[in-house]
């Protein structure tokens, strides 16, 4: 699902109070809910009738440093026999999310958000009817 | 997928270097890649075969605002005649993000990063064997 | 945090009838299915009954079918156990609870559990 555009105004300070200096912004440090954790049922990208593989994607100037993408396995479904069915259509389910971007020079060191694409699993599909009959 | 505990380092300077004053960071305004955006295939929430409903949640002092869940609709899957079979499982697939919580007592504002469980989706699975018979 | 109340057990004799009621609290946004299960002085505790708060679809342990009937209320954000036909063997401390993971959760995947109910079910 989509993020909307922040056009700013969350960042700014209300129009009665000075701006804000050099265009940043003081972020604490930590993290709320830190410890909370994705506790999804076990395998279940092998268990799908649309199965996915994940690739680990690493960078130390982001945080989280490990973003892990999925891959649907099919171009269709796997059917009870085990079998790949081509009239039904695996397909990626996508979430914008925000990462953190490390810059540094130096001592001084900013940070900036990051808006990244992921895509979290695969569903299987009744596909749409149209120009490829 | 889970986000890795941040143990703080990486928003701490080199050793070498000053501590961050008052335990906060710069961060610098605006959203790199801002204007990329999730690509989907078109009604998959309903075209699946284990569909799902959406409900936004609102939050004016959180960045994103909305925040977007995914419920799954059946117990079981939707099978080629557009009926429930309850012998396969809708299962949810969740991503851990990370979102900016605002937090201002007149005009001092500032900023942490929060950690939020979204429900993207859902997949159908086959069971595993256990005490649902 | 989940709060889960049950109600409605108590002692009944066999061929006789029960409806219990749980109220949840605290839900996640995204939970979508809710359980009754039960357990039985000296057993495991057991899956009964698991209903979909959206479609009102619903499963039920081979134990239990025809003659246990799982509704639920949205508004309110209660579901019910209607029990007929009672035998004694139904005799157990009933709960509910959410499924996160709907007909895929496991046992170990609670966290936390209500007080539960008794069912007494008398010859």
């Known amino acids: 699902r989509k993020i909307p555009k922040v056009g700013h105004t969350f960042f700014q300070k209300p129009e009665s109070c000075p701006p804000v200096p050099g265009g940043s912004m003081k972020l604490d440090i930590g993290i709320i809910n830190e410890n909370q954790r994705v506790s999804m049922s076990r395998n279940i990208e092998s268990r799908s009738t649309s199965p996915w593989n994940y690739t680990v994607t690493w960078d130390p100037n982001r945080y989280p440093s490990e973003v892990v993408q999925a891959q649907c396995r099919n171009l269709g479904c796997i059917n009870a026999q085990g079998k790949e069915d081509i009239s039904m259509n695996s397909v990626p389910i996508q979430q914008e999310t925000l990462v953190v971007r490390r810059k540094h020079q130096g001592c001084s060191v900013s940070f900036q958000l990051e808006k990244v694409l992921v895509t979290v699993g695969c569903t299987c599909v009744t596909p749409v009817i149209h120009h490829v009959q | 997928r889970k986000i890795p505990k941040v143990g703080h380092t990486f928003f701490q300077k080199p050793e070498s270097c000053p501590p961050v004053p008052g335990g906060s960071m710069k961060l610098d305004i605006g959203i790199i890649n801002e204007n990329q955006r999730v690509s989907m295939s078109r009604n998959i929430e309903s075209r699946s075969t284990s569909p799902w409903n959406y409900t936004v949640t609102w939050d004016p002092n959180r960045y994103p605002s909305e925040v977007v869940q995914a419920q799954c609709r059946n117990l079981g899957c939707i099978n080629a005649q557009g009926k429930e079979d309850i012998s396969m499982n809708s299962v949810p697939i969740q991503q851990e993000t990370l979102v900016v919580r605002r937090k201002h007592q007149g005009c001092s504002v500032s900023f942490q990063l929060e950690k939020v469980l979204v429900t993207v989706g859902c997949t159908c699975v086959t069971p595993v064997i256990h005490h649902v018979q | 945090q989940v709060q889960l109340v049950e109600s409605g057990g108590g002692l009944v004799q066999a061929g006789g009838s029960l409806r219990l009621s749980c109220a949840a609290s605290?839900?996640?946004?995204?939970?979508?299915?809710m359980g009754w299960f039960r357990q039985a002085p000296g057993k495991e505790r057991e899956f009964v009954a698991a209903?979909?708060?959206?479609?009102?679809?619903?499963k039920y342990a081979d134990s239990v079918k025809d003659r246990f009937t799982m509704s639920r209320d949205n508004a309110k954000k209660q579901v019910y156990l209607e029990m007929n036909s009672l035998k004694p063997e139904d005799t157990a401390v009933y709960y509910c609870?959410?499924?996160?993971?709907?007909?895929?959760?496991?046992?170990?995947?609670?966290?936390?559990w209500g007080q539960g109910i008794q069912v007494t079910v008398s010859s």
């Open positions: 609870n959410d499924m996160p993971y709907g007909l895929d959760t496991r046992m170990d995947d609670y966290k936390y």
């Open positions: 605290g839900l996640a946004v995204s939970s979508y299915a």
């Open positions: 209903i979909s708060w959206i479609s009102g679809g619903t």
